[in-house]
Interface confidence: medium
C-alpha cells in the first residue's frame, strides 16, 4: 500500500481551507476525547480509477468519495481520517484531511474525495472514513467503511496498468491442447517477445475427482529473437493410467519484470465422453475401477479409449 508519488495532495475547496497530512492511523482524539463530535460520513463510495505517475506509469487507485450529513455537527468537524486496510496482509495506510477553517452550511451538500491510494490487482481492501474528532468511548460511531475488491490482471482495463504489464499481462499465449492418443498430449502456445525460458506444468486428474493422478514439469529454453511471437509446440508423454484423463496444462513464463511471479496461463482438456449405451466389447473395461483399500490407478493398456481432439 502506498500513495501515488506525485502531485501536492489537495483537499481545499471553495469555502474550506484544508491540508492533507500523513497519518499514523491513531488520531489524537482517541487519546484525548472531545465532548462534542461530528456525525458520520454519508454515501461513502469507492471506485476504481487509474492515475499516471510523473514517470508515465499507470496505476490503479482507489477513488474515495463521501458527503456530509446536513446537521449542525459540521460546526464541530475538524477533518477526516481516511484508512485503507489490505485484508490479506493487514497492512494499513492512512491520511488525514485537516480543516484549517470552520465549515459553514451552504446550499449544496459538502462533498469530499481522494484518489491517491495505489491498490494492487486482485486484492481486497477495507476503506474507512472517520470524521474527526473521533467519538468518545460510548458515543455513536462517526465512521463509515466499505470493502473494495480490485479486479485482477485478466480485466481488460487492468491489463494495461504498470503492475499488470510487469507481471506479463500483455502476453496472450493462446494455448491449444490436443490429445494425440492415450499417452501423448500436444501443447501449442505463442511465445512472448523476450529471451526467457518457460515451464509447462501438467497436472492430470480422474474424470470426476480433484486429486491429481499424474504430474509432470517440462522446461522450454529461452527462444531466440527470430522465434518471438511464433508458435511453440511440445508433445508431452503421459503415464497411461486408467481413467487419468482430465489434463490441466499451465504455462509459467519467467519474464525479467516478474521472474518467478509472472502470471500463468492454463488450459484444460476434458475426459473423452463415454457413449450413453456402449456397444459390448469382449474385453471392455470401465474407464476406471474403484477398488477397496487402494487409491492407485491400474497401469494397463487402455484398450477401450478413442482419440478425441480438444482445442482450447
Amino acid at each position: 500500500l502506498r500513495l501515488l508519488d506525485h502531485r501536492a495532495l489537495v483537499c481545499s475547496q471553495p469555502g474550506l481551507n484544508c491540508t492533507v497530512k500523513n497519518s499514523t492511523c491513531l488520531d489524537d482524539s482517541w487519546i484525548h476525547p472531545r465532548n462534542l463530535t461530528p456525525s458520520s460520513p454519508k454515501d461513502l463510495q469507492i471506485q476504481l480509477h487509474f492515475a499516471h505517475t510523473q514517470q508515465g506509469d499507470l496505476f490503479p487507485v482507489a477513488h474515495i468519495e463521501w458527503t456530509l450529513q446536513t446537521d449542525a455537527s459540521i460546526l464541530y468537524l475538524e477533518g477526516a481520517e481516511l484508512s485503507v486496510l489490505q485484508l490479506n496482509t493487514n497492512e494499513r495506510l492512512c491520511v488525514k484531511f485537516q480543516f484549517l477553517s470552520m465549515l459553514q452550511h451552504h446550499r449544496k451538500r459538502w462533498r469530499f474525495s481522494f484518489s491517491h491510494f495505489v491498490v494492487d490487482p486482485g486484492q481486497e481492501y477495507e476503506v474507512t472514513v472517520h470524521h474527526l474528532p473521533k467519538p468518545i468511548p460510548d458515543g455513536d460511531p462517526n465512521h463509515q467503511s466499505k470493502n473494495f475488491l480490485v479486479p485482477d490482471c485478466e480485466h481488460a482495463r487492468m491489463k494495461v496498468t504498470t503492475p499488470c504489464m510487469s507481471s506479463g499481462s500483455l502476453w496472450d499465449p493462446n494455448i491449444t491442447v490436443e490429445t494425440l492418443d492415450t499417452q501423448h498430449l500436444r501443447v501449442d502456445f505463442t511465445l512472448w517477445n523476450e529471451s526467457t525460458h518457460y515451464q509447462i506444468l501438467l497436472t492430470s486428474f480422474p474424470h470426476m475427482e480433484n486429486h491429481s493422478c499424474f504430474e509432470h514439469m517440462h522446461h522450454i529454453p529461452a527462444p531466440r529473437p527470430e522465434e518471438f511471437h511464433q508458435r511453440s509446440n511440445v508433445t508431452l508423454t503421459l503415464r497411461n493410467l486408467k481413467g487419468c484423463c482430465r489434463h490441466q496444462v499451465q504455462i509459467q513464463p519467467f519474464f525479467s519484470s516478474c521472474l518467478n511471479d509472472c502470471l500463468r496461463h492454463s488450459a484444460t482438456v476434458s475426459c473423452p465422453e463415454m457413449p450413453d449405451t456402449p456397444e459390448p466389447i469382449p474385453d471392455y473395461m470401465p474407464l476406471w475401477e474403484p477398488r477397496s483399500g487402494s487409491s492407485d490407478y491400474k497401469d494397463d493398456d487402455d484398450k477401450g479409449s478413442s482419440h478425441h481432439h480438444h482445442h482450447h
Epitope: H49, L58, H155, A156
Partner: antibody, heavy 131, light 107 residues
Framework: QVQLQESGPGLVKPSETLSLTCTVS????????WNWIRQSPGKGLEWIGD???????NYNPSLKSRVTISVDTSKNQFSLKLSSVTTADTAVYYC?????????????????????????WGQGTTVTVSS | DILMTQSPSSLSASVGDRVTITCRAS??????LGWYQQKPGKAPKRLIY???SLQSGVPSRFSGSGSGTEFTLTISSLQPEDFATYYC?????????FGPGTKVDIK
Amino acid sequence: QVQLQESGPGLVKPSETLSLTCTVSGGSISNYYWNWIRQSPGKGLEWIGDIYYSGSTNYNPSLKSRVTISVDTSKNQFSLKLSSVTTADTAVYYCARDGELANYYGSGSYQFYYYYGMDVWGQGTTVTVSS
Amino acid sequence: DILMTQSPSSLSASVGDRVTITCRASQGIRNDLGWYQQKPGKAPKRLIYAASSLQSGVPSRFSGSGSGTEFTLTISSLQPEDFATYYCLQHNSNPFTFGPGTKVDIK
C-alpha cells in the same frame, strides 16, 4: 444525461488523414474511457481504439499504425486521427463512452463486481473516402 | 483477437414470438459481454451488460444469459419495435470485438 456528438469532414481524399472530434456534453470526460467505433456500409461494427481521460490509449492492432486518439479535458472533447486512408475506410464513425466502472453491492457493504462496456453512443457521422 | 460468432445471421419472426440469439466467443471471456440493438440509420443501443444484467430503461422482455464462451439473448415476446439487428460485444480483452450481427425481421 451525457450526450456525445461527432463532428468532422464528411469527405476525405485517399492517402489523406481523417480527423474527427467527439464532444461530451451533460457530464464530465474525467474518470471514463472513451471509444471510437466504425461501421462500414452493410458491414458489422469494428472497435478502433479508446482513450482514458488521463491520455492513456489502447488501439486495435489492425489499425494501430494509422490511428491516433487524443483527449482535451478542458474542452470535454476527444479526437480521432486516421492517416493514409483508402476507400476501405469509408464508414459511419461512432464515439462511445465506456460505462462507469460500476461497483455492484452484495450483502452488506461488499463491493464485488466491475463492469465496463459501451453504454452511451454518439449518433454517428458518415465519412466517405473518395477522390 | 477474440472472434465472436452469432447465430442465426438472420431470422423472421412474428409479433409475440419468443426469439433467441446465440453469441459464441473463440475463447473464454467470463461475463464481459454486452448485447446491442441497432436500427437502420441509428447508433447501437445497449440492452444487456455483464452478460445478464438489464440496462436501465430497457423492457424486461429482453434477457441475457451465459458465461465463458456461450451467451444468449432472449426476447420473450417480440414487439413491433424490436425488429432490428442485434450485436454482441466482448470487452474482455483488446481489441474489443463485435459479433457479425443477427437481423430480426417480420415474417
